[in-house]
């Protein structure tokens, strides 16, 4: 006899895991056999779909490899033409392990600002997310939360934040890590320590110090007057974040000195000053102060000036009294830039015998100054026009510095030697006498205002000098 | 920071040359006099030779004057030392070092880390 | 040829003062010699400690100290420490003419007991 179709298995709900096979079974009595069709969420799922896999007369659908989009609810629908067409529903709940679809990724931030490692997961039931640093679970405090979404928001970051994260996506089936990502912490770069101002002696060695801070570690660079650090030596070391850098000076002239600590974040840099102030104390003092030592002199700028193996006056309020006096020399030379072929090697030899003034060794180490008649040569005779020159520029504040005031001499304030012979000395490249001056071109219109002294002539070369040095 | 790398040693025979390199960084190399010094293996300091910081004049110990050179190339920030006619009792370690000042003579306050200058056959 | 001449080795009691000596086998040092002293520990390079006859470099702790006594440049450690313990060297000018020379001592080996 014709029966109706009565469905005498209902559907149930499946739970299946993505990848595998999920089955539902409609089992059906009635005669004639009925027309078994499917439907996900109301809509009608086609025989030919290899995705599925009807048998028993359509009373077995078979999923075959469940995806997650898979969710939802299915019916079967049983008809033989006897009665009513008769239904049955079940749903699919696709159950998946966590899988994180959104891992976090390396970061750098600046210290200061809020940094959000994304950490989006996907699972059926919802996995819960966590986060580690390091090796151990990381503390949500008022700064340092875990998302909805899972991923992990840090306010006002800290270079303590910095480290190796990653997330953990947890549910019932089983867990999912990320890999590991680096926080890194980048802070501007800062001064710790400033250098400081010193006022200070010509000639004396000074460092400055300066310390700065940062990530990455800062380049600190020194300027001098605006410009880059032209001379000294630089020293820098650096140890646990924090560069120190020592620039070690000598003395010349007064000088604004500005370290400067920079890095780099990302294309953009950040940069911290300091300055310090060098001034010169007491310019005329070392000439006045008689504390020092004699010895043999062994630079070079006067090697072809003094007398061979001369015992010098080394003046101990230079903290370095022969580079002191060989700068003194050199600079000097330099600031008396035009000078003729007549007044060079004279000129020389003054400076030299001045600056390196001879030695009398004693219990008081005492220099000699030069000769009166032989500074006034040099000034009014062999570099008249110079040394006019060079006062006015004096006068008018022209000099880069006022080191040249210690390098030549006042001819009135020396002593002559006609008080004294053994308390001034000679220049010894100023061999001429009376006859050989005839020759030298008038440079004066003046008469010199003392009587140059009758020296013995001498055959070799009056004004060899070494041309490494010379004046122009 | 202040540096100086020496380079430029090795074995050499009797009667061979050698020249040694000194590079220098973190300070203003043509302000300051630069020395040569050795120490043979297991002796004490020998003075080479000196140079003041504008190359204008040179020094030498007596036992290597007309065989060894010193030159610098301040544009270079480098230092050398040509070797020639090299004896075994040149084996040592040949330092760089650094002047604290201009002139050639006086205390080194800089040294590299030395170059090892084996003379033998 | 003048030869520079130290005590072969010494040694001195950690807090302990010692001085170290530096003469000419020939004449005396003086001033002109511009004694400078420098130390060197083992498998390192040297390091000046004093220029100048008793100029101290910089960085040098102020236990170091030079001076000229008598006819021999001198070294004075005050107060000693386990880390001074190393070999020294003085060196000396010797200019004469245009002659110059720049000469070691052998160095002397210190020992902080």
């Known amino acids: 006899l014709p029966k109706a179709p009565v469905i005498t298995t209902p559907l149930e709900t499946v739970d299946a895991l993505v990848e595998e096979v999920a089955t539902f079974m409609c089992a059906v009595e009635s005669y004639p056999q009925p027309e078994i069709s499917w439907t996900r969420n109301k809509i009608l799922i086609k025989l030919f779909d290899t995705r599925y896999s009807i048998r028993e007369n359509g009373q077995l659908l078979t999923i075959l490899s469940v995806e997650d989009s898979d969710d939802g609810i299915y019916c079967c629908t049983a008809n033989n033409g006897v009665g009513g067409a008769v239904e049955s529903c079940g749903a699919l709940q696709v159950k998946m392990k966590p899988k994180i679809t959104r891992p976090p990724i390396n970061v750098k931030i600046i210290e200061g600002l809020k940094a959000v490692l994304p950490c989006t997961t996907m699972g059926n039931p919802k996995p819960s997310v966590s986060w580690i640093k390091g090796d151990s679970p990381l503390r949500e405090n008022s700064r340092i939360a875990v998302l909805e979404s899972g991923s992990l928001r840090i306010h006002n970051v800290q270079k303590e934040d910095a480290g190796q994260y990653r997330c953990v996506a947890k549910n019932s089936l089983g867990t999912a890590y990320s890999k590991v990502v680096k926080l890194e912490v980048e802070v501007f770069a800062r001064i710790l320590r400033a250098p400081e101002s010193h006022n200070v002696t010509f000639g004396s060695f000074v460092t400055l110090h300066c310390t700065a801070t940062g990530i990455p570690v800062p380049t600190i660079t020194w300027i001098e007057n605006g410009n880059a650090v032209s001379s000294g030596s630089i020293q820098e070391s650096v140890k646990d974040r924090v560069i120190d850098s020592r620039l070690q000076l000598f003395i010349t002239k007064p000088g604004l000195y500005t370290c400067i600590a920079t890095n780099k974040h990302g294309e953009k840099f950040s940069t911290a000053k300091a300055a310090a102030t060098i001034s010169i104390a007491e310019w005329s003092k070392p000439q006045k102060d008689n504390k020092g030592y004699c010895a043999q002199y062994r630079g070079e700028v006067c090697n072809a000036v003094l007398a061979k193996d001369a015992l010098v006056f080394l003046n101990t309020s230079y903290a370095d009294p022969e580079e002191a006096q060989e700068l003194l020399v050199h600079t000097a030379w330099n600031e008396l830039k035009v000078v003729s072929p007549v007044c060079r090697p004279a000129a020389e030899a003054l400076l030299c015998n001045h600056i390196f003034q001879e030695c009398s060794p004693g219990v008081v180490p005492t220099p000699i100054p030069i000769c009166r008649e032989y500074c006034l040569a040099v000034k009014e005779l062999f570099c008249a026009k110079e040394w006019l020159v060079m006062e006015e520029k004096t006068h008018r504040g022209l000099y880069r510095s006022e080191m040249h005031l210690l390098s030549v001499p006042e001819c009135s304030k020396l002593p002559s030697m006609h008080w004294d012979p053994t308390a001034c000395a000679r220049l010894p490249h100023l061999d001429y006498n009376k006859e050989n001056l005839k020759t030298f071109p008038p440079m004066t219109s003046s008469k010199p205002s003392v009587d140059i002294p009758n020296l013995p002539s001498s055959s070799s070369s009056s004004f060899s000098v070494s041309p490494t040095y010379s004046m122009t | 920071e202040l540096q100086l790398v020496e380079s430029g040693g090795g074995l050499v025979q009797p009667g061979g040359s050698l020249r040694l390199s000194c590079a220098a960084s973190g300070f203003t190399f043509d302000d300051y006099g630069m020395s040569w010094v050795r120490q043979a293996p297991g002796k004490g300091l020998e003075w080479v030779s000196a140079?003041?910081?504008?190359?204008?004049?040179?020094y030498y110990k007596e036992s290597v004057k007309g065989r060894f050179t010193i030159s610098r190339d301040n544009a270079k920030k480098t230092l050398y030392l040509q070797m020639n006619s090299l004896k075994s009792e040149d084996t040592a370690v040949y330092y760089c070092?650094?002047?604290?000042?201009?002139?050639?003579?006086?205390?080194?306050?800089?040294w590299g880390q030395g170059t090892l200058v084996t003379v033998s056959s | 040829q003048a030869v520079v001449t130290q005590e072969p080795s010494l040694s001195v009691s950690p807090g302990g003062t010692v001085t170290l000596t530096c003469g000419l086998s020939s004449g005396s040092v003086t001033s002109s010699n511009y004694p400078d002293w420098y130390q060197q520990t083992p498998g390192q390079a040297p390091r000046a400690l004093i220029y100048s006859t008793n100029s101290r470099h910089s960085g040098v702790p102020s236990r170091f100290s030079g001076s000229i006594s008598g006819n021999k440049a001198a070294l004075t450690i005050t107060g000693a420490q386990p880390e001074d313990e190393a070999d020294y060297y003085c060196?000396?000018?010797?200019?004469?003419?245009?002659?110059?020379?720049?000469?070691f001592g052998g160095g002397t080996k210190l020992t902080v007991l």
């Open positions: 140079i003041p910081w504008n190359g204008g004049s040179t």
């Open positions: 070092a650094k002047r604290s000042g201009r002139i050639a003579f006086g205390a080194l306050d800089a």
């Open positions: 060196a000396l000018y010797m200019g004469r003419g245009s002659n110059k020379d720049y000469v």
